[in-house]
Structures are given as C-alpha cells and as structure tokens.
C-alpha cells in the first residue's frame, strides 16, 4: 500500500471548500434578467415572489401581482398578456425532456382583480403563450393546438391530428426538441397576432426506444419514445399557418418546402416572422451541409403562402456541416427584406453578413480571426452582437454595437472596459427597440447584472451584484484559475487550469482532466463557478485542467471541422497532447493523473483511458455515448454522416468505446449511468459493460435508478458526487 497523502492548505484562517458546500449549493450566484414589457418597462419576480413592475424613466415601481396570489395556486412562473389585462400563472410543473414540461395554468384578471373562471384551461397543458398583441391565448393540449380569443372565451380547436407519440402539433418531438429547435414549442405568432404558424411532426414511422421506469410499483413502467437513432427513419415535418381572426373560415394553410430541400430527407430548422404577412422558414437537408432560408408572403387573393424561388437563400459548407451547433437565424432589418446573419466567411470564421438580395452578394459586416457569436438586436441605427474578439481570448464574450446608420458603419465595444478584471463574459437582454438593456456578466469574477441606456450605453443601475455571495466567500480559500494557451505543432489549444490554494510550482500535484469536447462546444470560458472541481482543488489539492481541442467552437472552421466524419479521434488526441504538455510544466505527479467527463465528455474520457498511452491512472465516464449508432440521428449524422456502407459506417464502427475494451485493462474505470436516460440511453453503458466483461476487464460501475441524463435529483446527485470523490481520492491515494 502506498502511504496516504493529505493536502493541507497552509496557515490561513480561511477554510477550504467542502463537498457539502457544493452539494448544498451554498455558493450559487444570482443573475437578473428583466422581463421586458415595453421600451422602458419591465417586470421582475422579487425574492419574496411578488411580481414587480418597473418603469425606468419615471422610476415608478409597484407590485403588479402579489405573492399571495402566486401562492394561492402554488405558481412558479407567470406571463403578462401584452394588453396587461391578464397574467397566466404556471403551477404543477412536471418536467418531461430537456426543455419540455407540462403544467397547470390559471389566468388572473388584473382588470377585475380575480381569477378567470369561464371556460377554464384543461390540464396538464404542454405549452401556452399569449399573442404578441392583446390577450389571445394559444395552447397545446394532448398534442393539439387550441386558441382562445380572450381568456374567458371558449377555446377553438385548430388541429385534430394530434396523437401521443405519433403526431405532435405546435410542440416538437424528442429529437427536434433536443437537437434542432432547443425549445419546448413549435409555434410562433405573427407580430400583430393575426397569424399563428406551427409545425406538425409525424413520428408514426420512427423506431421506439423503450426503457423501464421502476418507480414504487410492483411492476416497472415502460417509457416509450419515438427516437430516431443514426440512419433510422426521421420525423416527417410540415409547417402550417392559421389565420386566428377567422380560424373557422379557412383552415390552416401549409407552407411549401423549397424544391431543392424536398427532393430528399430534410429537416425544418427554424421560423422567424418578418412582418405581419411575411415569414421566414429555414430548412436543412438530412446531410446537414446545405441549409435553405425561404422567405414567404401571404397572398390574400389565393389565401395561401407563397415562397418564390428568388426568395430562397442557400447556405452550404464544403468543409463540414452548415452553421455552428445550429444553423444561425436571421435578424431582419426594418425594411422586412434585408437581414443580418452569422455564417462562415471565406477564411472559415463565423461572421455577421448583410444579405440584401442574394447570399452571393452578401456584405461582410465583421471580420477577423475570431467569431461573431450572436446577434441580439437590430434597430434602425444599431446592431448589437456578441463576439470573442477582445484581446484574442476565444472563451470571452463581449457585447458590441455597430452603428449601421453611419457610413461606413462604426463598431464600439460596449462591455470591454466596464469591469475589466471582474467581467469578461457577458450576455445581454434588450428592451423591444433597445432603448434600454441589461448586461449580465458571468465572470470570471462574481457575476453582476446592470441596467444601461441603449443610446449612450451609460450604466443606470446595478440590478444584482451578489453581495451576499461575496461576503460568504470572504473566509473561503478558493483556488486560482488560469486561462492560457499551449502550442503543439501548428495547433493552439486553450486551457483552463484550476490550481489549489498556496499552489507551489516546485511541488507535485495530482491532475484531473475534465473533458466535454463535443463538436461546437466550449469548456474554456471566463466564467465564475464554484462547483465540484473547485472543491477538489480547494480541499483535496488536485490540479484541474480543461482543454478545448479540435472540434470545439469559436476558433474558426478549420479547428471546428477537423473532427467532421471522424468523431473520437482528434478530441482524444488533443486531450492527450495537453496532458503531456502539463507534465512538462513540472508540477504534475505523473503517477496520479485522471480524466472524467459526462455525456460527450464520458465518451472522450473513455476513449482517452483506452488510448493505451499509460498517461491515466484512472477515470470516470458519466452517461457516456459509446457508439454514434446509438445516438440521435440529427446529432450523429450532422458530424458523422450516415452509418451506411457507402457513407461512413466504417468510422461509426471503429469509433466505439466497445472496440477498445481490451485497453481498459491497465486503468481504473468508473462507469456511471442513469437508467431512465432519455437522451444517451442506458444501452450505451450496458454495451460498454458487456464488452468489458467479455474481455474479462475489471471495472467499477454505478447506475442511478430512474434518473435521466442529468442525474439531478437531490439524493442521486449527492450520492454521485460523493461516490466520484471517493473513487478519485482512492485513485490519488488521498486520505478521507
């Protein structure tokens, strides 16, 4: 037996973080996002659950909805109708998948100071929203869409085709929710509330994933989800638009699919209303390197939607897939014809382009060896966007304003110099026409949310500065965080290193690599966090490193598309390269190096452990993908193509974790998975375990009954992190 090694932070009255701190969420931070209801007014839910109205200009504030009203129905969320006459209150939240949930909705009448009783909403509802004007309600119940002209009116049923697990109207099926839309809804009101666009997903021919949910009963339940894995039959999508003024006169009208898309399997990717009678739809070929943006107009004479060929804009990638993780959405100008959009420039960096007529004639608005990330708002004279340009750090986000009214347009960084040390990673929330906006800074210092004037960018007030958190952290020994880059051959890899308090370069420390590494992801970000790895550095004296290898985002397509059609190769290689570089730094104990990851990170950590390099003593994979054939079609095929002989079956087969089972012989491997994982099915870990058993390789495993991909129930999460901590401490010979 090795002597146990105990890390003791030296002579300091401050205490180290404990695992309990992390599990209890003792050091969680707050952000403040105004719920904008006009150009200068917003709502916010106070600490004591009152819904408070604020007017920035008059400095007026009052309770619009009392906590007693919220409490009377156990409401956890709310939504004010645009005419400000009603509020929906959401309760009985019941999570389904990543974004979707069902809930009970109550309508409170602000005019009359009471709940609306006539024609109550059914329960549970899958999605509900107000029209952008007035107080019409659209909602989805049992996979069908309903409309109410006023909350107290009888509902009008718009669709009748809805059927559980077969046809979904106005809400996405599993794969569209997770991999394409990233929302719980698939319906969109026109700006004036006249039209309602929605998608119908037909999953009738999709294979079913079935797994047991054990619950408390004598017999387990079986959960059935239409889930297309790589190469399987996909949902059939159709987009319809209904006139909500006269829904009974003319039924929903189907929007035509562009010919070049409809000729083979395709996806709907997003819908953007341009004006009250103009809509923009985005489509994607199943082989996701061709995207078509189609602008359609309402023809009153035909009572139909027309999408002329000259209003089709094609975006194609020759080096990988179209877009980043998703294809970007357009930000239309006031003229309702031209738009701004982020896509790759000739050098392979994602930048803002202005499209007036054709994509070929697009005017590039931003350029450089960095990337534009998101367009927040386009107004008459300004365009607000975020990028990682400042000082060349890919893991930062600053907000910029381009004055498009000027010729040539001038660019200003709104956030770069505000709180330079504390704030390097921002997002923003704008009022309707950007008269005011809130900045939310996520770090690297303590998060802070501030309110700003949209004309001058002057700070008006601090909305949330996490003073309590600052005070409670005063007596905590936090680790030191460094973000740097390392070079290997012609490649540059950014990494984040979390160093124990009183770190001493002349000493040797155990190293834990935390990896995700999925295409278009980013782990090395300048954000504040107090989590499990912070604890491991603070209390257990472990050096933590996160490395963004090839395939990760915001550093150009050459770096991003390097993994195209060959997942599981360079992501792993680059983690190994980084580990070797860290060893060269001289403070890493080569005998005590571990790697861990979750989901895609579980896949990479498994492959790294099975790389046969002898670099790692041990590692953990939580809910890992083990074969791309087991994962969702939209995701797997985006990066790997199809698992067919004439496409990419060979790499599908040799990129599995199972294919490397023999190589786990000389490492300590902890495999963890939730049995009710709807996303990365338990099947993935079951197959790894089977292969390891067949190869007579010893390993450790833990399953979490009835837990999904997040293993997030309080008890399970506590057990998980405690278990992983014991495993790591044992691996690193750290005493309990």
């Amino acid at each position: 037996l090795r002597p146990s090694r105990v890390y003791k932070p030296e002579g300091n009255t401050k205490r180290a973080l404990t695992l309990k701190d992390i599990l209890n969420g003792t050091f969680s931070y707050k952000t403040y996002f105004p719920n904008w209801i006009s150009e200068q007014e917003y709502l916010h839910q106070s600490e004591d659950d009152n819904i408070v109205f604020y007017n920035i200009e008059t400095r007026e504030s009052y309770i619009i909805l009392s906590n007693s009203t919220m409490k009377s129905v156990n409401a956890t969320d709310y939504g004010l109708s645009p005419d400000r006459q009603f509020v929906y209150l959401e309760s009985d939240y019941s999570k389904l998948w990543r974004y979707s949930y069902t809930a009970t909705y109550y309508i409170y009448d602000l005019q009359n100071g009471e709940f609306v009783r006539g024609y109550e909403l059914p329960r549970p509802i899958q999605y509900l929203c107000w029209s952008p004007v007035g107080s019409k309600l659209a909602y989805v119940y049992q996979n069908n869409i309903y409309l109410k002209q006023r909350p107290g009116d009888p509902p009008f049923q718009i669709t009748y085709t809805g059927r559980e697990n077969r046809i979904f109207n106005g809400i996405p099926d599993w794969v569209y929710e997770e991999e394409m839309l990233a929302t719980k809804y698939a319906l969109w009101w026109s700006p004036d509330g006249k039209f309602l666009a929605y998608v119908e997903f037909n999953d009738s021919d999709i294979p079913i994933i079935a797994y047991s949910y054990y619950g408390d009963g004598q017999y387990p339940r079986t959960i059935n989800i239409p889930y297309p894995k790589a190469g399987a039959k996909n949902p059939v999508v159709r987009v319809f638009i209904v006139d909500t003024t006269y829904p009974h006169h003319v039924g929903p009208m189907e929007v035509p699919v562009p010919e070049m898309i409809a000729s083979s399997d395709y996806y709907f990717s997003w819908l953007t209303w341009v004006s009250s009678e103009r809509v923009c739809l985005q489509w994607l070929k199943r082989v996701q390197n061709v995207s078509v943006l189609s602008i359609c107009d309402f023809r009153e004479d035909w009572h139909a939607w027309e999408c002329p060929k000259n209003q089709e804009h094609v975006e194609e990638s020759r080096t990988g897939w179209a877009g980043g993780f998703f294809v970007s959405t357009p930000a239309f100008s006031q003229d309702a014809t031209s738009y701004y959009k982020i896509f790759s420039d000739k050098d392979g960096y994602k930048h803002i382009h202005y499209i007036k007529d054709t994509v070929e004639n697009a005017i590039q608005i931003t350029s450089g060896k960095w990337e534009a990330i998101y367009i927040f708002r386009v107004t008459q004279d300004s365009l607000f966007y975020s990028s990682n340009e400042f000082e060349g750090y890919p893991g930062r986000r600053n907000i910029y304003r381009i004055s498009i009214g000027n010729s040539p347009p001038s660019k200003k960084c709104v956030t770069c110099h505000l709180r330079k040390e504390r704030c390097q990673y921002y997002t923003a929330s704008f009022s309707y026409k950007a008269k005011y906006y809130a900045l939310v800074c996520y770090g690297p210092g303590l998060p802070i949310s501030t309110l700003h004037d949209g004309r001058t960018d002057q700070e008006i007030q601090v909305l949330e500065e996490n003073k309590e958190l600052e005070n409670s952290l005063r007596n905590i020994q936090l680790p030191k965080v460094e973000i740097k880059k390392l070079k290997d051959g012609g490649l540059t890899f950014w990494y984040k290193m979390i160093l124990p308090p009183q770190f001493d370069r002349s000493k040797k420390y155990p190293l834990l690599i935390q990896v995700y590494g999925g295409p278009c992801s980013q782990s090395v970000k300048s954000v504040f966090a107090v989590n499990w790895i912070t604890y491991l550095a603070s209390k257990e004296g472990i050096v933590i490193a996160l490395v963004d290898g090839r395939g990760t985002a915001f550093q150009g397509d050459k770096f991003l598309h390097a993994v195209y059609r060959k997942l599981g190769v360079y992501e792993v290689e680059d983690q190994l390269t980084a580990v070797r570089k860290f060893i060269e730094m001289g403070f890493i104990d080569e005998e005590r190096i571990a790697i861990w990851g979750w989901s895609y990170g579980g896949y990479v950590s498994s492959l790294a452990l099975a790389s046969g390099t002898g670099l790692f003593k041990c590692g953990i994979a939580v809910a890992p993908v083990s074969s791309w054939e087991y994962y969702a079609s939209i995701y797997s095929e985006r990066f790997m193509g199809l698992p067919t002989k004439d496409d990419n079956l060979e790499h599908y087969k040799n990129s599995t974790v199972m294919a490397r089972a023999e190589y786990f012989r000389n490492v300590d491997y902890l495999l963890i998975h939730g049995t009710a994982d709807d996303n990365v099915h338990f099947q993935n870990s079951a197959q790894i375990a089977k292969a390891l058993v067949n190869a007579q390789v010893d390993f450790q495993a833990m399953w979490y009954s009835d837990q999904n991909h997040g293993i997030s129930s309080g008890r399970s999460q506590n057990h998980l992190y405690t278990h992983m901590t014991h495993f790591l401490k044992q691996c690193f010979s750290l005493s309990d």
Epitope: Y106, L110, E114, E120
Partner: antibody, heavy 124, light 113 residues
Framework: QVQLVQSGAEVKKPGASVKVSCKAS????????IHWVRQAPGQRLEWIGG????????NYNQKFKGRVTITVDTSASTAYMELSSLRSEDTAVYYC?????????????????WGQGTLVTVSS | DIVMTQSPDSLAVSLGERATINCKSS????????????LAWYQQKPGQPPKLLIF???TRESGVPDRFSGSGSGTDFTLTISRLEPEDFAVYYC?????????FGQGTKVEIK
C-alpha cells in the same frame, strides 16, 4: 365607516357626455375594484364596467364599449365614469359599487357597498 | 353572456309568511376547483341602492338577519325569507359574478298581501 359618495344629478341633451364621480372613504381604496351599474326606470340592474385602482385598467361591458370611459384617481380615492353620445334610453340611476380584489384562488367577491346613485336624465 | 332569469316577477306575501324566490342561470355558476357558486342576492328598496344579502349562493353578509337564506347550486338557486317582516318588502335581485360581464336577474318584487 365605508362610504361611496357620488356626484349629483345631471340633465343632459342627446349626443352630450356625462361624467359621474364616486369618492370612496373608510377603507383601503386599492383593495377593492370599483364598478358602475345603472338602473333605467322599471329595468333590471345593468353592469357598465369596472376599474382596478392598482393599475388603472378598466373593463367594460361590450354593450357600452366605445361610449364609456372609466378612470380612477388613486390619490383622491375617486373613480369616474364618463358616458358619451347620450341618448334618451341612457336615462337611469347610475351607481358605483366596490368589489374586493381576490388575491387568492378560492376567492371571488360580490359588490358589498354601493354609492347612493346619481340620476342622469337625457332629454332634448 | 350569462343570462339570469328570476321567478316570479312579483310575489304577494303576508307578514310572518315565507317567501321563496327562484333564480336560474344560463350556465353553471359552480366553480369546479373550489366547489363554490358565484351567485349573490341583493335587496333594493325604493330610492335606495341595492344592499348585499347573500354571496357564494348561501353565505349571509354580516349584519343580515338569519331569516334570509340562500340555497342551490350550478344553475338553480333560491332565496328564502322565512318570516317576512315589514322592512323586507322590496325588490330582490340575483347576480352572477362567475364571469364577465356581470349580469343581474330582472328582479322579483315582494309585496304585502
């Protein structure tokens, strides 16, 4: 004690407008909505509309929409009802009444106190 | 709109006798989630504003004598005055406050026989 005191009787010509006030006292003004109800000779009571003093949002009976305007002055604890384009059939006694705001889901209240009434006569 | 219909239109009753007034609504006033009926009864004397007697169909407003009682559920309701006193001769209105617009019955006049 609770009181709703209305302005005095009015005689108006057809096509004119009338504005009736209702001053509240003896209770917290913002805890109740104010409603307007009229009673034409020999007719049933007819609800015209109401207003929530907390946000000034009015709610009108569709029958009167476009002709009626209900407002509130919270600082004076007073509500107003203005009816325009008067016709002879608008001749009635106009009452204001209070109705408690229902903060809780199980609540819902009747109109428990009424003003003394204002006679509006429309005659050429 | 919910239509409220009272019967009879008028009622002649002797002092000390029982008076029963009926009220029917065109749709149910029973709220399933709290099992309450959103119906009120008012008394109106000449030259005076209406006075609240009963709410929730059967709950007496404070200060209202116990000879007044309300009953019924859903769409059919009754106001009963068990022993008429001289001051009870008036017009009685039912009113629904289940949904907007608020609506009243046409009234029932209780006269001395």
């Amino acid at each position: 004690q609770v009181q709703l005191v209305q302005s005095g009787a009015e005689v108006k010509k057809p096509g004119a407008s009338v504005k009736v006030s209702c001053k509240a006292s003896g209770y917290t003004f913002t805890e109740y909505t104010i409603h307007w109800v009229r009673q034409a000779p020999g007719q049933r009571l007819e609800w015209i509309g109401g207003i929530n003093p907390n946000n000034g949002i009015p709610n009108y009976n569709q029958k009167f929409k476009g002709r009626v305007t209900i407002t509130v002055d919270t600082s004076a604890s007073t509500a107003y009802m203005e009816l325009s384009s008067l016709r002879s059939e608008d001749t009635a006694v106009y009452y204001c009444a209070r109705r408690r705001i229902a903060y809780g889901y199980d609540e819902g209240h009747a109109m428990d106190y009424w003003g003394q009434g204002t006679l509006v006569t429309v005659s050429s | 709109d919910i239509v409220m219909t009272q019967s009879p239109d008028s009622l002649a009753v002797s002092l000390g006798e029982r008076a029963t007034i009926n009220c029917k609504s065109s749709q149910s006033l029973l709220y399933s989630r709290n099992q309450k009926n959103y119906l009120a009864w008012y008394q109106q004397k000449p030259g005076q504003p209406p006075k609240l007697l009963i709410f929730w169909a059967s709950t007496r407003e404070s200060g209202v004598p116990d000879r007044f009682s309300g009953s019924g559920s859903g769409t059919d309701f009754t106001l009963t005055i068990s022993r008429l006193e001289p001051e009870d001769f008036a017009v009685y209105y039912c009113q629904q406050y289940y949904s907007y617009p608020l609506t009243f019955g046409q009234g029932t006049k209780v006269e001395i026989k």
